[in-house]
Interface confidence: medium
């Protein structure tokens, strides 16, 4: 069988938008299955047509309604006779049109007055491509080749840049770049503090605007009184917007205030925030825990818990706990020293343990009680155990 | 003179397998590719797919890849559609066209100019 | 999956011209084709390749295509016209046909 590309030259250049018809002819074939290719893939489309010359004599046409860049490349077509694959000279299809732009100015953030570039490149076919800058409405500099950067010394307000690429089918103009100018950041918002203990806090907040330049750290200051004394500044890269306090004083009032910076400076601070950290829990386990049988159940008696520092604060209730073997367990809450204890069951050994509370948390446990249930009624059970 | 004979109207319960044909005639059949088209009662024509005239590669729509299979027999001239479970949303006019090619002149070609009178197949319990 | 899109009636008056247009995101790159369906027929090919007309069809039909618009007109509507049209291109990559959902066209 022969093949040919008919009607078309080895090389064919189209200008974008308009149809092309590849003809190839098939002599010697009485019904060949022509396939087009392009770049070594075989064409799936539907834009195939064959029409039979004569019995041995075959056009098969590849039709492009409106080309684009995309359809430039190497086109064969090839049919199969007798198991091999037949293919024809190749003709390579060039796509002409406007300049097509590969790198357009991007949008910038710059402080006053400080020098920076923009870059434009575009392409052909045809070439050459020339580019032309534009700041705002006026044209700046002469015709450039492609690729082209602009090196402005500096702007003082937010202003407009585009570029425009020029070749002999025409022109083509870029998106437009704005240059912000930079500035100092706004002031954080919504500061929250979080996670109060005695000792530590979380803060967390929201920054203001970046003023057009990254957010490089935040400063918080903490104060015993707002405008007193600084007691802690910590600076935090950011993000994340949090910070961690430490080695604060229990039962504190405190305030602070948060301030970012990008890098022309800091923010104002934001307001301050005041809060307080808790006491200390109670450092004391309360002591001769023991225990009355009565006729109506058990008695549970305990001595006093003193507090120890004054960053204790008020102490009390008691918290009470109590477990069997049988897997019964419970907690009350008690106010005074004393604690009647209903729903255990006599028959089963009985565990106790109490811990004096204040605002912050229950202290530590007491040693455990052991009630045995081989005591007599009316008997006081003394620990068994002194681990704690 | 260009002819297409399709297979006569069909009644179906859901779930029964079908195949409609499509014999051609007084043109080569291995000229022209066979497409199969749709119509639903009183709705539009939809694109079902194609078969080349090699028969030997098919194209379908996204609606029907899967549902229903085309083929052809290039020794009898005949185009096929075939469904293996019908569902009561089958219901419509099926036509078989000639599409590709052109005239004997090799100047005009014949888009979808010359179609099947139809078969219609009715799919109800 | 792709779409062309008519709308579903045009009526005009016998001697008036009628537009029916077709549009579709790939016709920019694709053909299209024009069908007319009288009821109870077959439909038949009236234009192809966006302008040309089918042979055996009157002149008074024409089409034509800009970017993702295709449009037939029938200069001078005749009553015998009435009938459902329906556009037919290919999706972007050509891997398949579509048809318009079909337009029709009242000639009062």
């Known amino acids: 069988a022969g093949l040919k590309l008919m009607g078309a030259p080895v090389k064919l250049t189209v200008s974008q938008g308009q149809p092309v018809k590849l003809n190839c002819s098939v002599e010697g074939m009485e019904e060949p299955d022509i396939q087009w290719v392009k770049d070594g893939a075989v064409v799936q489309n539907l834009d195939q047509l064959y029409i039979p010359v004569s019995e041995q004599h075959w056009i098969g046409f590849l039709s492009l309604k409106s080309v684009e860049r995309s359809d430039a490349g190497r086109y064969w077509c090839q049919v199969e006779d007798g198991g091999e694959t037949e293919i024809s000279q190749p003709v390579w299809l060039t796509v002409e049109g406007v300049p097509f732009f590969t790198v357009e100015p991007k949008d910038l953030a710059v402080p006053p007055n400080a020098p920076f570039q923009l870059s434009c490149e575009a392409v052909g076919p045809p070439e050459p491509v020339t580019i032309v800058w534009w700041r705002g409405t006026t044209k700046i500099g002469g015709p450039a080749p492609s690729p082209s950067v602009l090196n402005v010394t500096g702007v003082t307000q937010s202003t407009m840049f585009s570029c425009e690429a020029h070749n002999l089918k025409g022109l083509a103009s870029s998106r437009t770049a704005t240059v912000h100018l930079q500035a100092l950041p706004a002031a954080p918002f919504n500061i929250t503090v979080t996670k109060l203990s005695s000792s530590n806090a979380s803060v967390a907040w929201m920054p203001g605007a970046d003023g057009r330049a990254l957010l490089q750290s935040c400063t918080v200051q903490v104060t015993q009184a707002p405008g007193g004394w600084e007691v802690l500044a910590v600076v935090v890269p950011v993000p994340p917007f949090t910070c961690l306090l430490r080695d604060l004083v229990p039962a504190t009032n405190y305030s602070l205030r948060v301030r970012c910076a990008n890098a022309l400076g800091p923010s104002p601070y934001a307001d301050w925030v005041p809060f307080q950290t808790k006491g200390l829990a109670p450092a004391s386990a309360p002591q001769n825990l023991h225990a009355i049988r009565t006729d109506s159940g058990l008695i549970l008696e305990w001595e006093e818990v003193i507090p120890e520092a004054p960053l204790e604060g008020p102490l009390g209730p008691y918290k009470l706990s109590w477990v069997q073997d049988n897997g019964t367990q419970d907690e009350l809450t008690v106010e005074g020293t004393r604690a009647n204890l209903t729903g255990w069951d006599p028959q089963k050994d009985l565990i106790v343990r109490v811990c004096v509370s204040n605002a912050v948390g229950c202290g530590p446990w007491s040693q455990p009680l052991v009630v045995s249930s081989h005591d007599r009624a009316g008997q006081q059970g003394p620990p068994h155990s002194r681990t704690s | 003179e260009v002819q297409l004979v399709q297979s006569g109207a069909d009644v179906k319960k859901p779930g029964a397998s079908l195949t409609i044909s499509c014999q051609a005639s007084?043109?080569?059949?291995?000229?022209?590719?066979i497409s199969w088209v749709r119509q639903k009662p009183g709705k539009g024509l939809e694109w079902m797919g194609q078969i080349n005239r090699h028969a030997s590669n098919t194209m379908y729509g996204p609606s029907f890849q899967g549902h229903v299979t085309i083929s052809a027999d290039r020794s009898t001239a005949t185009a096929y559609l075939q469904w293996r479970s019908l569902e009561a949303s089958d219901t419509a006019m099926y036509y078989c066209?000639?599409?590709?090619?052109?005239?004997?002149?090799?100047?005009?070609?014949?888009?979808?100019?010359?179609w099947g009178p139809g078969t219609l197949v009715t799919v109800s319990s | 999956s792709y779409e062309l899109t008519q709308p579903p009636s045009v009526s005009v008056s016998p001697g008036q011209t009628a537009r029916i247009t077709c549009s579709g995101d790939a016709l920019p790159k694709k053909y299209a084709y024009w069908y007319q369906q009288k009821s109870g027929q077959a439909p038949v090919l009236v234009i192809y390749e966006d302008w040309k007309r089918a042979s055996g069809i009157p002149e008074r039909f024409s089409g034509s295509s800009s970017g993702t618009m295709a449009t037939l007109t029938i200069s001078g509507a005749q009553v015998e016209d009435e009938a459902d049209y329906y556009c037919y291109s290919q999706e972007r990559k050509g891997n398949y046909f579509v048809f318009g959902g079909g337009t029709k066209l009242t000639v009062l």
């Open positions: 066209v000639r599409s590709g090619g052109a005239t004997s002149g090799g100047t005009i070609p014949e888009y979808y100019q010359h």
């Open positions: 007084g043109y080569t059949f291995t000229d022209y590719w």
